[in-house]
Every structure is written in structure tokens, then in C-alpha cells.
């Protein structure tokens, strides 16, 4: 009679053999869809995905027969643990299909969503290329606002109903898998159980993220204040000296990475540019060269070359008009030794570093390829994100850029170039941390049911102001879904990985630099050519998920938990410099200010006192009527006073700060032009002219429908109709 453990081993051997094939078919079909978005490829992907899901469901059921408490061998135990998780297969067939449809539809909307010029509907832009280009390079406040708003209006609004359903179905899946909600399910990736001294709970992750964020905050607040002062120079009169930063001015479509603000914020502009984009263009670099240089880096520390199949099968440039692809960079481990990258590479320093990041994923994938199928993954999701980032820390150093000919041989490092370098690094690394923390905190709260869906956007922008110090340039009501305007949200990726990875990458960098015998400050360390550092890293990579991440971390850095100290050490010289720069400015931000505040009019409505028992409820329909009434007043005013026929619509009356005791602010924009705010004085004149019509629409008078700052009309108070 064989033991339970032996039976489990036999079962897992069989599973590993069969899984390899089915997973490969599913991955290949998914790759084909991602590189060529067509209806046929969606169908093929779904069919292959269904087969894989059915197999997993069946195997998961069989895996339940092996009680974990009877398994001593950690490798066997971990595989069974992974397989006993049912994932989406716990849902009924119709719900599972619906969830799949939602995920595919969101992905397609995101990757094919277009924004068209209101004056020329034939002139349209995709996110990539097009809108991303504007958000990376434009210094025109209104052009940026157009791109920012249009993307959210076109794509975010389409995604809203789908995302609402997604939340419900994913929560149902998570609860059926014995998690509290889908956020808890995601946090499960960090959980370690039953390994003495190395256990880690899902709740611990929340605590660690919260307290490390508190430690990072002072550095971020000083970076924020410095950037605000520089943005005030670039966009005079658009930014408050004590306010949040307008969300559309921050270097990309989401304000996720501030890298592109470097040219506006460079501390010592007279020094040679350490953003080597121009040098890359001058030297005729292309996507192939970028990835070959990244490969050289990994090889120099003793890690393997990319496979021949990698070079043959990867899609490293935008296919352009030939076909539509998902352009967000991704690294693929399809199984059977087939590794690929999908990226619409542009010749920029940013993409040079992104190539290192993506190739880091592939190096990890290749390193743990010898592990059993179910343990081929990062020790946790943050580890997977950290590998390429470690390489990018070295690849970005002036020393390394000099060695590959992207900085001139006579480039001299001094205090000023050091501050330039560290500021550029901080724009990317420090600037993104509150963004990441806040986004995931919002999703965790949504999954937990702490934010009702009729307050998603309200809470999103409250948190964005409070935590990130960023404000919406125009108000967004609950028809929007701004979080889903980011790839990771609409494509169902957990996001806290980008926070944890940032802490890990500096912990790893510190340890690897010691292995490389680096002397001097951490930010000057370049581990290229150090096989000692490479070996130390590889020893961790090859473990995959076969050991608890806490142990894997301890093996490399000597500590079993995330620690923010190495990151703070790295940026210490910059922090000192920023404090000096900010000594005559306010550090921190008002959450009340918004770019549209000055042109807003406050409204107070008193239904109860005006109408008593006949008071009606103020709801979305009433607000629609209010906005329509103001649009009517605007049309009348422009026609009668200015002899202009301007077709204002209710969508041009933008409402913010709605309070339940019925007060709100509003302002008006020109039709089809969100950046053309009608001056408050003009709106006030229009209201005054149509005041009695507006009052009548709501059965109110000048006192119960109060426009603050607009003198009451001389018309008679509202008379109830004679019955």
C-alpha cells in the first residue's frame, strides 16, 4: 500500500505532463489574440482557455483527495496547495462564461479604444501610438486636457458597466475559494503558512504597505512640492501654490510615472542630458538594438542569453496598420521553453529601461523552468516585477550609459549630475508609489464593499487628492470609470506588486552591490559584469515558488520582510537637496482646491423649507433638469446678448462636490471643448437673465434655490399653479 504522499507524487507527475500541453495551447491562442486582435482570435483564445479551465477544474477536484496535513514533502505540499485553489472554475458555467466575456471585452475596448477630433470625426487616435505621445510630450495644457478627458470619456465610460459586473463575479469567485473578497484573494499571493519562522499573512501585507508608505511620505511630499513649483513655471496660472497637481500634467496618461517631467524639472539644466533618448536616436538605435543591449547586461552577470525562439517569436515593435495589438508591454512564458516579449518599443531611454524590466521577467521564467509546473512562478508577484528593475537601476547609471556609448566619454560626474540623476530616478520610482498604493487601496475597498458603487468616482478622486496630492482637471460623475482607464485595471492585474517590488528592488540592489564589491553610495552601483551578483540573484530565481518568499528574501538580503530603508538610503542625497530647495515654499497640499474652482458657482437648495411635505427627492433626474436649465440659460444669453447661436447641452454643465444636504458647485464649458471654460461672470449673467425660468422648473424661489454670489432677481417669488 503506497502512502498518501507517494500517491500525490504520482498524481502530480501525471498532472505536470498533461498540463504542459494544454497550457501551451491556451497561452499560444492568447498570444495570437494579444498580437492580433480579431474576432476569430478571440474565439480561438476562448476555446483553448475553456479546455484549460475544464482540465484545471477536474484536476483541482482530484487534488482535494490528498489532505495537506498528511504531506511532509514541502514541494509536493506547495503544488497541491496551488492546485486545490479552484480559481474561476468554482463559478457556474454561465457565470464563468460571462466573466470571460467581460474580461475579453474590457481588454478589447482598452486596446482598440479610439478618440476622435470633434471637428473632424475621421481624425482619430488610439492610446498607443497617439494619445500616449501627447501625454508624454505635449506642453499645451488644453491639448493634454483634451487627450486625458477624451480617453476617460470614450473608454472609461464604456468600461463602467463591465467593471461593475466584474467586481461582483470576481468577489463571488474569491468567496467560493474561501477568501473574504477578490482583494483578499490577490493578497493571498503573499501568504506563507506552516513554515516555522517564515509565515506571512494576508493582513500583514496591508500593515506592511501602510507603515512603509508612512516612511516614504516625507520624501514624496518634498518631491511633490518641487514638481509643483516647476509645473507652475510651465503652466502659469493653472496651478495653486498650495494645491494638488492637476492629473493631466504628470508625464503620462495616468500620472503613474513622472519620468517625462524630467525636462521641466531638471535641477541643473546646463549639465549634459542624462536622458539619453537623443543619443539613441542619433546613433540609429532600434527595438532590436535595445533588446540586444538588455540581453548583454544579463549575460554580463552570468545569466543566460535569450532563446532563439525568443528572437523569432517576440513582437518588439508596433505592427501599425497591419493589425491591432495590445501595446502594453508584457513578458510571456508560454511553457515548453517558449519565451516571448510583446512590446511596441519606441526609441527612448524609457523604453530602453522597460526592455530591461521585461527581460527580467523572462530571466526569472527561464531560471525556474526546471521547477514543477505549479511552482513556476515568482516567489511572490513583487519578486517577479523586481528582477528587471534591479537591472534598470544599474543600466540607468551614468557609469553604465557611458560604457555603452550613450553618454559621451568625457561626461564628468559631480554633485550636480548626481542630483540630476537622482531626480530623474525619483520621478519614476518615488513619484509612482502613492499612485500605486492609492489605486490598490481603492480596489481593495471596492472589493470589500466599503465603497458603494454610486460613490466609486467620488471616493476615487477624494483618495487621489488626499493620498497622492493629485486633482481631477474636470469633475467626473458616476458614469465614468477612471481606474479602468489604466491597463492593469481593465485587464485584471493586481497592482500592489508594483509597490512591493519597489521596496524589494532596493533591498536586492543593496545585497547584490555588496556581492559585486561595490564601494560608495548605492545610487552609483552598476552590477553589470559582476558574476558574483548574478549568481546570488540566480540562486533565488531558480527556486521559483518552491520556497516561501520570506525565506528566499532572507537568503539574498538577510531579512525576511520588506524594508524601505535601502530605498531611502539611495535617495538620501536628493532628499537633502529637495529640503533645501523647498525651504521657501509650502510642502503639502490643499485637498479643496481644483483647477476649475475659480470659475465655479456654488448652489444651495432647500427643498424641505420651501416645499414642506410636498418636497421631492433630489436625484439624478433632478440634477439632469438643473444642468439642462443652465444649458438653456446659456443658449438664451449667448443668443440674445451676444447674437451667437451656441448649442450648450446638459453635458457642458459640469457639477462637482455634490453634498447630500443639497449643495454643489458647477461651471460651464463650451460644447465639445472641455478645456474652454466659460468665465464665471458670463455664466452669472446668463443665470440672472433666466433666473425665474430656472426657479419655476424646480418650484423654488431665489432663497430656496440659491446661487451664491448671484444677486436675487426682482421677479416675483414662485407662484404655485392655480388649480
Amino acid at each position: 500500500q503506497s502512502t498518501i504522499e507517494e500517491q500525490a507524487k504520482t498524481f502530480l507527475d501525471k498532472f505536470n505532463h498533461e498540463a504542459e500541453d494544454l497550457f501551451y495551447q491556451s497561452s499560444l491562442a492568447s498570444w495570437n489574440y494579444n498580437t492580433n486582435i480579431t474576432e476569430e482570435n478571440v474565439q480561438n483564445m476562448n476555446n483553448a482557455g475553456d479546455k484549460w479551465s475544464a482540465f484545471l477544474k477536474e484536476q483541482s477536484t482530484l487534488a482535494q483527495m490528498y489532505p495537506l496535513q498528511e504531506i511532509q514533502n514541502l514541494t509536493v505540499k506547495l503544488q497541491l496547495q496551488a492546485l486545490q485553489q479552484n480559481g474561476s472554475s468554482v463559478l457556474s458555467e454561465d457565470k464563468s462564461k460571462r466573466l470571460n466575456t467581460i474580461l475579453n471585452t474590457m481588454s478589447t475596448i482598452y486596446s482598440t479604444g479610439k478618440v476622435c477630433n470633434p471637428d473632424n470625426p475621421q481624425e482619430c487616435l488610439l492610446l498607443e501610438p497617439g494619445l500616449n505621445e501627447i501625454m508624454a510630450n505635449s506642453l499645451d495644457y488644453n491639448e493634454r486636457l483634451w487627450a486625458w478627458e477624451s480617453w476617460r470619456s470614450e473608454v472609461g465610460k464604456q468600461l463602467r458597466p463591465l467593471y461593475e459586473e466584474y467586481v461582483v463575479l470576481k468577489n463571488e469567485m474569491a468567496r467560493a475559494n474561501h477568501y473574504e473578497d477578490y482583494g483578499d484573494y490577490w493578497r493571498g499571493d503573499y501568504e506563507v503558512n506552516g513554515v516555522d519562522g517564515y509565515d506571512y499573512s494576508r493582513g500583514q501585507l496591508i500593515e506592511d504597505v501602510e507603515h512603509t508608505f508612512e516612511e516614504i511620505k516625507p520624501l514624496y511630499e518634498h518631491l511633490h512640492a518641487y514638481v509643483r513649483a516647476k509645473l507652475m513655471n510651465a503652466y502659469p496660472s493653472y496651478i495653486s501654490p498650495i494645491g494638488c497637481l492637476p492629473a493631466h500634467l504628470l508625464g503620462d496618461m495616468w500620472g503613474r510615472f513622472w519620468t517625462n517631467l524630467y525636462s521641466l524639472t531638471v535641477p541643473f539644466g546646463q549639465k549634459p542630458n542624462i536622458d539619453v533618448t537623443d543619443a539613441m536616436v542619433d546613433q540609429a538605435w532600434d527595438a532590436q538594438r535595445i533588446f540586444k543591449e538588455a540581453e548583454k547586461f544579463f549575460v554580463s552577470v552570468g545569466l543566460p542569453n535569450m532563446t532563439q525562439g525568443f528572437w523569432e517569436n517576440s513582437m518588439l515593435t508596433d505592427p501599425g496598420n497591419v493589425q491591432k495589438a495590445v501595446c502594453h508591454p508584457t513578458a510571456w512564458d508560454l511553457g515548453k521553453g517558449d519565451f516571448r516579449i510583446l512590446m511596441c518599443t519606441k526609441v527612448t531611454m524609457d523604453d530602453f529601461l522597460t526592455a530591461h524590466h521585461e527581460m527580467g521577467h523572462i530571466q526569472y521564467d527561464m531560471a525556474y523552468a526546471a521547477q514543477p509546473f505549479l511552482l513556476r512562478n515568482g516567489a511572490n508577484e513583487g519578486f517577479h516585477e523586481a528582477v528587471g528593475e534591479i537591472m534598470s537601476l544599474s543600466a540607468a547609471t551614468p557609469k553604465h550609459l557611458k560604457s555603452i556609448g550613450l553618454l559621451s566619454p568625457d561626461f564628468q560626474e559631480d554633485n550636480e549630475t548626481e542630483i540630476n540623476f537622482l531626480l530623474k530616478q525619483a520621478l519614476t520610482i518615488v513619484g509612482t508609489l502613492p499612485f500605486t498604493y492609492m489605486l490598490e487601496k481603492w480596489r481593495w475597498m471596492v472589493f470589500k464593499g466599503e465603497i458603494p458603487k454610486d460613490q466609486w468616482m467620488k471616493k476615487w478622486w477624494e483618495m487621489k487628492r488626499e493620498i497622492v496630492g493629485v486633482v481631477e482637471p474636470v469633475p467626473h460623475d458616476e458614469t465614468y470609470c477612471d481606474p479602468a482607464s489604466l491597463f492593469h485595471v481593465s485587464n485584471d492585474y493586481s497592482f500592489i506588486r508594483y509597490y512591493t517590488r519597489t521596496l524589494y528592488q532596493f533591498q536586492f540592489q543593496e545585497a547584490l552591490c555588496q556581492a559585486a564589491k561595490h564601494e560608495g553610495p548605492l545610487h552609483k552601483c552598476d552590477i553589470s559584469n559582476s558574476t558574483e551578483a548574478g549568481q546570488k540573484l540566480f540562486n533565488m530565481l531558480r527556486l521559483g515558488k518552491s520556497e516561501p518568499w520570506t525565506l528566499a528574501l532572507e537568503n539574498v538580503v538577510g531579512a525576511k520582510n520588506m524594508n524601505v530603508r535601502p530605498l531611502l538610503n539611495y535617495f538620501e542625497p536628493l532628499f537633502t537637496w529637495l529640503k533645501d530647495q523647498n525651504k521657501n515654499s509650502f510642502v503639502g497640499w490643499s485637498t479643496d482646491w481644483s483647477p476649475y474652482a475659480d470659475q465655479s458657482i456654488k448652489v444651495r437648495i432647500s427643498l424641505k423649507s420651501a416645499l414642506g411635505d410636498k418636497a421631492y427627492e433630489w436625484n439624478d433626474n433632478e440634477m439632469y433638469l438643473f444642468r439642462s436649465s443652465v444649458a438653456y440659460a446659456m443658449r438664451q444669453y449667448f443668443l440674445k446678448v451676444k447674437n451667437q447661436m451656441i448649442l450648450f447641452g446638459e453635458e457642458d454643465v459640469r457639477v462637482a462636490n455634490l453634498k447630500p444636504r443639497i449643495s454643489f458647485n458647477f461651471f460651464v464649458t463650451a460644447p465639445k471643448n472641455v478645456s474652454d471654460i466659460i468665465p464665471r461672470t458670463e455664466v452669472e449673467k446668463a443665470i440672472r437673465m433666466s433666473r425665474s425660468r430656472i426657479n419655476d422648473a424646480f418650484r423654488l424661489n431665489d432663497n430656496s434655490l440659491e446661487f451664491l454670489g448671484i444677486q436675487p432677481t426682482l421677479g416675483p417669488p414662485n407662484q404655485p399653479p392655480v388649480s
Partner: nanobody, 120 residues
Framework: EVQLVESGGGLVQPGGSLRLSCAAS????????MGWFRQAPGKERESVAA????????AYADSVKGRFTISADNSKNTAYLQMNSLKPEDTAVYYC?????????????WGQGTLVTVSS
């Protein structure tokens, strides 16, 4: 000539309150916007609170949010800092400052400071 004179500091027990005043002359408060800063012994000067030129918006450092309130009385050309629930770590010299221009990032004139000591 621009002048800023702080007053209202003193010794107070933890949990107590103080109201600092900043009398401004040589410029109009309702045009510039003001800020309060503090410097504890052996530490760098740090932001405490600020108010916009029109008084519509206020901002506070995390460490004082919910406890301190900045305000201005334009008729008296005076700014105030109401400090409640004071803690020992609030001990510092408090300075008021005038913004260099209403919509600019920087402050150009500073008062001499008033000492606040929170101790039992």
C-alpha cells in the same frame, strides 16, 4: 517696507491650545497669501499651514491636520494659526511668511518667530 510680526506663543500643557497672530504691514494680506512654518531645536524648518491669497483654500502638513487652523482677517491685515490638542512634538519657533506673488510657489518675507513650548 514689508514687516511681519508674530505673537501669541508661550508655554502650554499637552492637550492645550494657543492662537498665534501675524500682523502684516507694507503689503495687503488679501493679495498675497500667507504661510506658517516652524523650526524645532536642531531640526530643519518645516511647513505647517498655508492659505491662498483669496482665503478660499487652506493646506496643512500631515502632522497638524485636524488640530491646527489657519485663517486671515483682511480688515486687520492679520493672519492667525489656531493650535488645538497640542503635543510635545509641536514645540518649535513658529514663523509666518508672505508669498512672493499671489500665485507663486515661494515665500519671500519671514517674521522673527514666536516660541511655542508644549510641556507638562
Amino acid at each position: 517696507e514689508v514687516q511681519l510680526v508674530e505673537s501669541g506663543g508661550g508655554l502650554v500643557q499637552p492637550g492645550g491650545s494657543l492662537r498665534l497672530s501675524c500682523a502684516a504691514s507694507g503689503f495687503s494680506l488679501d493679495y498675497y497669501g500667507m504661510g506658517w512654518f516652524r523650526q524645532a531645536p536642531g531640526k530643519e524648518r518645516e511647513s505647517v499651514a498655508a492659505i491662498s491669497w483669496n482665503g478660499d483654500f487652506t493646506a496643512y502638513a500631515d502632522s497638524v491636520k485636524g488640530r491646527f487652523t489657519i485663517s486671515a482677517d483682511n480688515s486687520k491685515n492679520t493672519a492667525y494659526l489656531q493650535m488645538n490638542s497640542l503635543k510635545p512634538e509641536d514645540t518649535a519657533v513658529y514663523y509666518c511668511a508672505k508669498r512672493a506673488n499671489p500665485t507663486g510657489a515661494y515665500f519671500d518675507y519671514w517674521g522673527q518667530g514666536t516660541l511655542v513650548t508644549v510641556s507638562s
